[in-house]
Every structure is written in structure tokens, then in C-alpha cells.
Interface confidence: medium
């Protein structure tokens, strides 16, 4: 047992320290007092603390804890927020390019179908964007609407251009005939399969990133309980009451306290690990028909093939439709019909010919690798916070919550704390309601991610030439199909380097923390993600 330090006969040091926390000295005793009203820093002898000081220490301790937690998650939060923004914008760029390729296909091959085709194409891709961002739109509806709208124009402009104006009331009949006679063959179904699979995966990917942000934001802004505040006060400030201003808490003691305070948060760990691994699985499956970049940029070719299919069968179709729609007197039409001009961005068409070294797919993989370094983020938090707050090295000559000890013993500390506070009780309370809610959301997204990941044992051959399919090669299983026999138009051999088009290149490695208010520990943040290497058997 080390000798007790000489008491501060005047509480002078305590007064000067406390004044930094709370201007004015009315709460600080001038000389040590019995402290019988204290509830947290229970004195073994005279103390320089009052009940009001104790309350202030508790408030400060909880604020410190919140700041430590926020600085701990800063790099991870930045990583996900920036990538969510990059991917959302990149997906919108893909949609814009896909629309322009398709419009260019119509302009180059079927000028008589413009501007009506431009409108239908524009609205189709608007719906694609809305779907990716979470709108409640049915992909089959989108594709049906596109072909329903296109067929009357194809019929009246390409197949039967001599049709008198008086016969143009047959549009509704033509829309119906489009489905009944399968005038585009299996192409609409092929496009539905490709577009729905690739967009579903894209949508869930964005949804998962946004949930990641929500998880971090939730734990970032946790309010710690009063019990935790008392434990933190005892660890960080009660030593001051005895005039021990320079003494640091024992490392082992800090870990016990942090595990108690963070018992609820640490419960997220299991679901967070699963979230990152499920997201990785999803990303690994995002190629060919599960990759919207690949599918949407090849769509113009499949649509072109579908129109060629109609033209090949024009003779037979014209006869059948002539009989079917000859007496149609319906003057109304389904809402998508009327032409509405859109423009082609010629600048974008040139992009297709550039060699592009960075694809969305490589960016996704890079994100996953960075996220995996945070796989142990939640289980490592207590240790991280202790390593970023003042603790005594090697647990020697340190504060154990009650007194200065030569060596920290967890058992002794727990026995000594029994009367003051039950750590086990704190753990048993279970997570905060907000933490429970976020765990439920993680469970839900993890389930979605698992169901969206490509079925095991059906991995597609990545080496197949994705432009090599003829429309007849699809067979019954359209999962294996990717559209587009050659049509002498724009060849999208290289996927676009979308990030070059983004107004900003948000790379986490370049991210300075200096746009935020600097805290004393900001310079240590960058080392945090390496904790994963230490704590995680999964890495």
C-alpha cells in the first residue's frame, strides 16, 4: 500500500483546475471537507469536492465520452458518406449515358421515330433513376410502358408509313397488340430480367451504404446513461478530490469501465461484421447482368435488336394488325403517347471511345477493402477510447476509482466498487432503444443483402465475351443473357471512368479532418482503422 499523498491543505490545485471547467469558485471548498453529501466520489477522508462539483464532473465526463466516440467514428463516417455520394452520382451518370446512347441509336438508325422515341426513352430512364433512389416503381411496368409506347410509333412510322391521319386512332389497339402478339419477341422479357436484376442490386447497394451512415450517426450521437456518467467521473475526476491532479486511471480499470458504458453499443458488433461481409458478397456478385453499368450501357443495342426483330416480321404483323385494329374507334390513348422532345448530348457520345481505367466495379471493391479494415470497429471501441484518453501505462501507480494503487487488480477494483456501483447491472440493462432499432435495421438489410447476393453454384463465367450473344442464344434462362448483337453503332467496349466526370474526387485517403473542429486527439484518428488488424480474427 503506497503512502497517501500529503493532503492539499487549501484545495488550491483543485480550485484552479475546476475553474477551467466552471468559471467562479463558489462550489469549491477552500479547505478539505468531510464530503458526506457526495454520491460518486465517496471520500475515505477529507475531500476537496462538493456535491455541485460532482454534478459538473459527471456532465463533463459524459460530454468527453461523446466527443471521444465521435472522433473514433470520424474516419469511418467520412468513408461511407463520401462513397454513398460518389456512387449515387456515378449511377446517375451511367443512366444519363445510357439514355444518350439509346437516343443516338434512334437518331442514327430510325430518325423517323424521333422525337417520340426520345420522350419514351427519357421517361424510361427517369424512372430508372427514381427506382435506384428508392421510388416504388415496378421494373416490369417500366419496360412494358417503354415498348407499349414505342410500338404504335414504330408501326405508323416504319411498318405502315402510308397510314392516313384518320387511322391514327388505333394507338390503343396497337398497344394491346404489342403484348398479345409478342411483336418484339422475347426482347422485352430479356430487358426486364436484366434491368430488374441489375437495378435491384444497385438499389440495395445504395440503401446499404445509407444505412451504414445511419448506424454510425446513431452510435455517434449516443447519450450515455447517468450510471455510465458516474463510472466515468469516478475514473477521470474523483482522484482530483484527493488532490491527485497528475494521476492517470489504470488501463485495465478503463477497459472495465468502457465495456460497462458501451455494453449496448458493442452489441452492434455481430451485425456490423455481418453487414460488411454481406455487402462484400453483394459487391462480388455485381457483374454481368447484376451490374447496372454493364446492363444499362448495353441497352441501346438490345432495343435496336428488338426493333430489327419487328422489322423482320413486319409483313406478317402488318396483316394481322390490319385485321385486328381495322375497326378500332377508340379516340383515347394510354397516357405515354404524345411526343415530347429531348436532346442528345453529343459530348457524351464521344466518351464511349475513350480508354477508361477506373470502373465503378473497381471503386466498389476498393470501398469494400477499406470497410473491411473497420470490421471490428464496434468490438474495438472500448479499447480504442481507453487508448485515446489518458491512462497509466503498464497499470502501475495508477488510479483505480478509489485510490492510488501500485498495480491494478481487476478483482480488487471490482470488490472495492461493489458498494458504489454494480457494473454487471449496467451490462444487464441491454442496449438503448435507439441501438435496438439500429440493430433491427441492420438485421433487415443483412437479410436483404443475403437474398440479393447471387445464388451459390451459379457463378457466371466472367471471361465470356459479353457482346457475343446473338438474340437466339438466350434459351430459357435469361439470367445468362446480355443484350446486343453488333449493329455498327457505338461500341461500349470500355466501361466509363465515371469518377473523372464527378465534380470532386472524394478519396478517403486524402480526407483532412481539418474542416471539423479540431480536438486534442484528432491527430490520432487515422490510426484507428488499424485496430481491426489487432482485434479481428476475421481479417
Amino acid at each position: 500500500q503506497p503512502p497517501p499523498p500529503p493532503p492539499d491543505a487549501t484545495c488550491h490545485q483543485v480550485r484552479s483546475f475546476f475553474q477551467r471547467l466552471q468559471p467562479g469558485l463558489k462550489w469549491v471548498p477552500e479547505t478539505p471537507v468531510p464530503g458526506s453529501d457526495l454520491q460518486v466520489c465517496l471520500p475515505k477522508g477529507p475531500t476537496c469536492c462538493s456535491r455541485k462539483m460532482e454534478e459538473k464532473y459527471q456532465l463533463t465526463a459524459r460530454l468527453n465520452m461523446e466527443q471521444l466516440l465521435q472522433s473514433a467514428s470520424m474516419e469511418l463516417k467520412f468513408l461511407i458518406i463520401q462513397n454513398a455520394a460518389v456512387f449515387q452520382e456515378a449511377f446517375e451518370i451511367v443512366v444519363r449515358h445510357a439514355k444518350n446512347y439509346t437516343n443516338a441509336m434512334f437518331k442514327n438508325n430510325y430518325p423517323s421515330l424521333t422525337p417520340q422515341a426520345f420522350e419514351f426513352v427519357g421517361e424510361f430512364f427517369t424512372d430508372v433513376s427514381l427506382y435506384i433512389l428508392g421510388s416504388d416503381i415496378n421494373v416490369d411496368d417500366m419496360v412494358n410502358e417503354l415498348f407499349d409506347s414505342l410500338f404504335p410509333v414504330i408501326y405508323t412510322q416504319l411498318m405502315n408509313p402510308g397510314l392516313p391521319d384518320s387511322a391514327l386512332d388505333i394507338n390503343e389497339c396497337l398497344r394491346g397488340a404489342r403484348r398479345d402478339l409478342k411483336v418484339f419477341g422475347n426482347f422485352p422479357k430479356l430487358i426486364m430480367t436484366q434491368v430488374s436484376k441489375s437495378l435491384q442490386v444497385t438499389r440495395i447497394f445504395l440503401q446499404a451504404l445509407n444505412l451504414g451512415i445511419e448506424v454510425i450517426n446513431t452510435t455517434d450521437h449516443l447519450k450515455f446513461s447517468k450510471d455510465c456518467g458516474r463510472m466515468l467521473t469516478r475514473m477521470w475526476y474523483c482522484s482530483y478530490c484527493q488532490g491527485l491532479m497528475m494521476v492517470k486511471p489504470c488501463g485495465g480499470y478503463c477497459n472495465v469501465v468502457m465495456q460497462g458504458c458501451m455494453a449496448g453499443v458493442v452489441e452492434i458488433d455481430k451485425y456490423w461484421r455481418e453487414y460488411i461481409l454481406s455487402l462484400e458478397e453483394l459487391v462480388n456478385g455485381m457483374y454481368r447482368i447484376y451490374d447496372m453499368e454493364n446492363v444499362l450501357l448495353g441497352l441501346f443495342s438490345t432495343i435496336h435488336d428488338s426493333i430489327q426483330y419487328v422489322q423482320k416480321n413486319a409483313g406478317k404483323l402488318t396483316t394481322t394488325i390490319g385485321k385486328l385494329c381495322a375497326h378500332s374507334q377508340q379516340r383515347q390513348y394510354r397516357s405515354a403517347y404524345y411526343p415530347e422532345d429531348l436532346f442528345i448530348d453529343k459530348k457524351v457520345l464521344k466518351v464511349a471511345h475513350v480508354e477508361h481505367e477506373e470502373t465503378l466495379s473497381s471503386r466498389r471493391r476498393e470501398l469494400i477493402q477499406k470497410l473491411k479494415s473497420f470490421i471490428s470497429f464496434y468490438s474495438a471501441l472500448p479499447g480504442y477510447i481507453c487508448s485515446h484518453s489518458p491512462v497509466a501505462e503498464n497499470d502501475t501507480l495508477c488510479w483505480n476509482g478509489q485510490e492510488l494503487v501500485e498495480r491494478y487488480s481487476q478483482k480488487a477494483a471490482r470488490n472495492g466498487m461493489k458498494n458504489q456501483f454494480n457494473l454487471h447491472e449496467l451490462k444487464m440493462k441491454g442496449p438503448e432503444p435507439v441501438v435496438s432499432q439500429i440493430i433491427d435495421k441492420l438485421k433487415h438489410i443483412n437479410q436483404l443483402l443475403r437474398t440479393m447476393s447471387m445464388p451459390k453454384g451459379r457463378v457466371l463465367d466472367k471471361n465470356l465475351d459479353e457482346e457475343g450473344f446473338e438474340s437466339g442464344d438466350c434459351g430459357d434462362d435469361e439470367d445468362e443473357c446480355i443484350g446486343g448483337s453488333g449493329d455498327g453503332m457505338i461500341k461500349v467496349k470500355n466501361q466509363l471512368r465515371f469518377l473523372a466526370e464527378l465534380a470532386y474526387d472524394l478519396d478517403v485517403d486524402d480526407a483532412p479532418g481539418n474542416s471539423q473542429q479540431a480536438t486534442p486527439k484528432d491527430n490520432e484518428i487515422s490510426t484507428f482503422h488499424n485496430l481491426g488488424n489487432v482485434h479481428s480474427p476475421l481479417k
Epitope: P115, Y338, D341
Partner: antibody, heavy 121, light 107 residues
Framework: EVQLVESGPGLVKPSQTLSLTCTVS??????????WNWIRQHPGKGLEWIGY???????DYNPSLRSRLTISQDTSKNQFSLKLSSVTAADTAVYYC?????????????WGQGTMVTVSS | DVVLTQSPSSLSAFVGDRVTITCQAS??????LNWFQQKPGKAPKLLIY???TLETGVSSRFSGSGSGTHFNLVISSLEPEDSATYYC?????????FGQGTKLEIK
């Protein structure tokens, strides 16, 4: 938040032309993906769709009003307008402007507060 | 034009009651039917779109069902503020058309 505000004379003489303007804020009449509509409601009666204009300037009208109707837009002022010629007492109504998405999401999600127009000599 | 016929044209019910308003289309409009609520002197407010999807911010007491030619709007437990006229509207065909309205009065 998108806001639409109708403006125009509250009283029009029979056989004259009714002119109304809808000013849009929080959104652009020239951006793709939306139809900008006029709808009217006769006193104590149901709603009647009049027509819409698209960002390209293309229009679509209710066949029952087509011969008397012109809908146009002024993108510089972010406005679209309705002109209904040869009005009669039957055109007395509250006129609303409203927005809807172009195709699969075709419900009217934003409406103006409405402006009452009376046709009377 | 597609004619939408609402029934009843008016009804009176007590707070807490469950009411159903029906909209019949003269031809198949798939799922493309919306429901609006209109209070005196106000613009209509979207409640349900595409037959059954609740608009954001609308009370879950409102629900819609149906497809093709027959559609229902159900208010599960009436509140005083539900006193209004309710309209159905189709957006499958041009011209877009509305039902004649159902006036709901709370006793």
C-alpha cells in the same frame, strides 16, 4: 419544397379569353420528367382535367376543350399559362395548376391553392 | 373517355367507424388509380396512388385496394378531420378523368 401559385383576373366577360398563369418555385418547368397541368372545378362539382405542358413545350389537352385551349410556358420566369378562348358561364370554376411525374408516377403530387374565375357580363 | 363512378355519392358516419368508398372504371385501367381528399376551399390532397400505395405523411387509417375496373378506399377508424369530399382519378388513359366525388360527413 415545390410551390405552385395561380394568378389572373377573377372576372372574365363571355366570349373573351380567360388567361391564367402558374408560377413555380422550388422546381423548374424546364427540367425533364414532369408534366405541368391545369385542372378545374365547377362550383359544387367534381374535378376536370384540362391539359398539360411538358418541358419540351409539347402539350396534351382534354379533347372536350382542345379547340379553345392553349397551354404555354415561359421558362425564363419559371411559369406556365392557360388561355381559354370564347368563354361562357360554363367555364366559371376554380382553376388549379398541378404537377405530376411524366409516366409511371402520374399522380398529381403538388397543387396550387386554386383561383376562382367567374364568367359574367 | 374512361368514366369513373364513385359510390356512394355521400355518406354519414360516426367517429371510430370504418367506411368504404368504391370507384368503378368503365374499362380496365390496371392499377393506375389515385385517391384524393378535398376539404372546402382547399386544393385536393393525394392520399393513395397506384390503387394501394399510401402517400408519404398520410395516416395509415387510409388504405386502397383493387385493380382493373373495381377499386376501394377504406378509412379504418374515422376521425373528425376526415370530413371531406373524396375523389378517385385514373392515370392510365388520356384524358385523365376523376370520379364525381363522395362527400363524407362525420356525425
Amino acid at each position: 419544397e415545390v410551390q405552385l401559385v395561380e394568378s389572373g383576373p377573377g372576372l372574365v366577360k363571355p366570349s373573351q379569353t380567360l388567361s391564367l398563369t402558374c408560377t413555380v418555385s422550388g422546381g423548374s418547368v424546364s427540367s425533364g420528367g414532369y408534366h405541368w397541368n391545369w385542372i378545374r372545378q365547377h362550383p359544387g362539382k367534381g374535378l376536370e382535367w384540362i391539359g398539360y405542358i411538358f418541358n419540351s413545350g409539347n402539350t396534351d389537352y382534354n379533347p372536350s376543350l382542345r379547340s379553345r385551349l392553349t397551354i404555354s410556358q415561359d421558362t425564363s420566369k419559371n411559369q406556365f399559362s392557360l388561355k381559354l378562348s370564347s368563354v361562357t358561364a360554363a367555364d366559371t370554376a376554380v382553376y388549379y395548376c398541378a404537377r405530376h411525374r411524366s409516366r409511371l408516377l402520374r399522380w398529381f403530387d403538388y397543387w396550387g391553392q386554386g383561383t376562382m374565375v367567374t364568367v359574367s357580363s | 373517355d374512361v368514366v369513373l363512378t364513385q359510390s356512394p355519392s355521400s355518406l354519414s358516419a360516426f367517429v371510430g367507424d370504418r367506411v368504404t368508398i368504391t370507384c368503378q372504371a368503365s374499362q380496365d385501367i390496371r392499377k393506375y388509380l389515385n385517391w384524393f381528399q378535398q376539404k372546402p376551399g382547399k386544393a385536393p390532397k393525394l392520399l393513395i396512388y397506384d390503387a394501394s400505395t399510401l402517400e408519404t405523411g398520410v395516416s395509415s387509417r387510409f388504405s386502397g385496394s383493387g385493380s382493373g375496373t373495381h377499386f376501394n378506399l377504406v378509412i379504418s377508424s374515422l376521425e373528425p378531420e376526415d370530413s371531406a369530399t373524396y375523389y378517385c382519378q385514373q392515370h392510365d388513359f388520356v384524358p385523365r378523368t376523376f370520379g364525381q366525388g363522395t362527400k363524407l360527413e362525420i356525425k
